[in-house]
Amino acid sequence: SEVEYRAEVGQNAYLPCFYTPAAPGNLVPVCWGKGACPVFECGNVVLRTDERDVNYWTSRYWLNGDFRKGDVSLTIENVTLADSGIYCCRIQIPGIMNDEKFNLKLVIKPAKVTPAPTRQRDFTAAFPRMLTTRGHGPAETQTLGSLPDINLTQISTLANELRDSRLANDLRDSGATIRIG
């Protein structure tokens, strides 16, 4: 089952995915696709990295974190209802059938209709990325009680949601993110 993340129409959605490179700069190819992870690689690819850089991306999809340190979380700009669905993050660890794959469910909610002051709109136009809003998972994915029901691989996608809490540090220290090498 997929871990669920939420965002409102017009916001930027955030889908977390991590791995720990074996050594600095020793990167692993990663792909993101719209749709569940297929047998290998990603279906309906929206973004790819190789051993050095991002080598393919489509409009509105980008990596906001430091992918050279293994933060390959996907940001989707200015989401619409059509962006709802399953997304695949696949970390293509070298070897035979060695990939780590994560299916993340993005739920887009209609925007709340609240009139914004003119000055706020001007600020948004001038600094659009400063107002990035990250989608959050359902409350139960952020409680200790639900963690035993979540795969270890899924925990790595939760770590970013929890990174400001002590639980995030506990997860990382216990190796919940993918370590390579």
Epitope: P29, P38, F40
Partner: antibody, heavy 119, light 108 residues
Amino acid sequence: EVQLLESGGGLVQPGGSLRLSCAASGFTFSNYWMSWVRQAPGKGLEWVSAISGSGGSTYYADSVKGRFTISRDNSKNTLYLQMNSLRAEDTAVYYCAKDHWDPNFLDYWGQGTLVTVSS
Amino acid sequence: EIVLTQSPGTLSLSPGERATLSCRASQSVSSSYLAWYQQKPGQAPRLLIYGASSRATGIPDRFSGSGSGTDFTLTISRLEPEDFAVYYCQQYGSSPLTFGQGTKVEIK
């Protein structure tokens, strides 16, 4: 124009080895996953193996795992299939195929090379 | 592994008729990850449809795919002489990649 040309097939005894090659042209070889698919005489298609563009990731069907090895040389635009411990049931036409940009399905195929395993 | 069962095994039709080929999966195929191929005697397969309904480059619009979950259909709206061949479905949603056993479309 995309072209895939297989070679290396032939008659081999059970337990023997064979190495198939597939010369590719007409596309940026290193950008695409590649696969081997086989077809026993008069039978349907069976996926055998796949390899990522860089060669770092490989996948195998259970029926060949541990016996077959897929590899590629991007400098030569060539795909390989090393087949060891061959069995009678490995007798088939072996097709080299290029995966689509979104891999897992095959948009160009070679004409195939026949491998016959018999004593 | 997902087993794909194609029916009928053989379809006998005349040029100009409509052909409907079925592919049923033993379990749900995620994200409609299903492709269709055509194979003529002595030739390599040719990709027709991927993602259950997207036509591959250069494929005439008389070929169409539909379906989701466990039931998929390839329709040839009006058979041309060159369409008589064997058709295979293939799923790529669950490891390993698997093909159906094929449906032969023959001239009646």
